[in-house]
């Protein structure tokens, strides 16, 4: 069964900067990745970035840099100052659309006890939805 993992990390150098990393553990080819904050895309969350293998990358402030890390994983840097910076308990979600598996989404947030710059290894997060 395909899985999606999500890792959220606060950067040690910039305390208002977050890095979100997501990956897809499946054999299909990825046609679209959507990153949202506040909850799953379309069910609480608002879109922060859309990554398409051919069309490129679409991102919304405060997303600073969305990029493909590998063919099946992406990263997104979020920056902000004051009100625009995400709070520690903000949920970030990644939705991978792949063929033939369909859409798979998982969410994560900053670990409650994490020090800046430290985070748990990217283990698969609970799968919230599979279309």
């Amino acid at each position: 069964t395909p899985e999606v993992w999500v890792q959220v990390r606060m950067e040690a150098t910039e305390l208002s900067s977050f890095t979100i990393r997501c990956g897809f553990l499946g054999s299909g080819s990825i046609s679209l990745v959507t990153v949202s904050w506040g909850g799953p895309n379309g069910a609480g969350g608002t879109t922060l970035a859309v990554l398409h293998p051919e069309r490129g990358i679409r991102q919304w402030a405060p997303a600073r840099q969305a990029r493909w890390e590998t063919q099946s994983s992406i990263s997104l840097i979020l920056e902000g100052s004051g009100a625009s910076s995400p709070c520690a308990n903000t949920t970030f979600c990644c939705k991978f659309a792949s063929f033939p598996e369909g859409s798979w989404e998982a969410c994560g947030s900053l670990p409650p006890s994490s020090d800046p710059g430290l985070s748990a290894p990217p283990t698969p997060a609970p799968i919230l939805r599979a279309d």
Epitope: G38, G42, T46, T47, R58, G80, A83, S84, P86, T90
Partner: antibody, heavy 120, light 107 residues
């Protein structure tokens, strides 16, 4: 019906701050982003930033970063845009506008606008 | 940032005329474009989203077309109430930018 009602006109001195409000009704407040756009006299439209009321998360145009703060009060379905260190070139009509949080493909409803005049 | 170039900057046309306004974008935005109409002293009104979709309540004489970097708003038969300034706007991520506007006057 969907409505965005903004606060009244403001006159401010250079260096001061202004806080404009936008009260939403007729839809689920936390389901949409609210953008702020301004228009200087006789000029075109300029995007300032947006806020997602559900989590209070916001994103601003680089030009306004550090000078603008957007907040949301979910209990009254009201969004606020505060602009500090005002200068004469900030004289403009400020609009709030609703945007679908998922599709993010248009601003479908707009407030009536708030004229902010910065003058010594 | 993505640049939007609208043309013409102004035009004068007669009732019943077919009017075309174009918007050229500095990079491919894959139809993530909206068109607005603004009348003096009023807020902009959404006409078209995703380049070709007519917003609710907008008369069918308005239509949008285009893809890639070139987009067009067409008014098939100009009506007296169509005067105003028209703006295009991209939604290919932030910062959102607008065209400089096309002022449409009725002859």
């Amino acid at each position: 019906q969907v409505q965005l009602v903004q606060s009244g006109a403001e006159v401010k001195k250079p260096g001061a701050s202004v806080k404009v409000s936008c009260k939403a009704s007729g839809y689920t407040f936390t389901d949409y982003n609210i953008n702020w756009v301004r228009q200087a006299p006789g000029q075109g439209l300029e995007w300032i930033g947006y806020i997602y009321p559900y989590i209070g998360g916001s994103g601003y145009a680089q030009k306004f970063q550090g000078r603008v703060t957007m907040t949301a009060d979910t209990s009254t379905s009201t969004v606020y845009m505060e602009l500090s260190s005002l200068r004469s070139e900030d004289t403009a009509v400020y609009y709030c506008a609703r945007e679908d949080k998922t599709a993010r493909n248009a601003m479908d409803y707009w407030g009536q606008g708030t004229l902010v005049t910065v003058s010594s | 940032d993505i640049q939007m170039t609208q043309s013409p900057s102004s035009l004068s046309a007669s009732v019943g005329d077919r009017v075309t306004i174009t918007c050229r974008v500095s990079e491919n935005i894959y139809s993530n474009l909206a068109w607005y109409q603004q009348k003096p002293g009023k807020a902009p009104k959404l006409l078209v989203y995703e380049a070709t979709n007519l917003a609710e309540g907008v008369p069918s004489r308005f239509s949008g077309s285009g893809s890639g970097t070139d987009y067009t708003l067409t008014i098939s038969s100009l009506q007296p109430e169509d005067f105003g300034t028209y703006y295009c706007q991209h939604f290919w991520g932030t910062p959102y930018t607008f065209g400089q506007g096309t002022k449409l006057e009725i002859k």
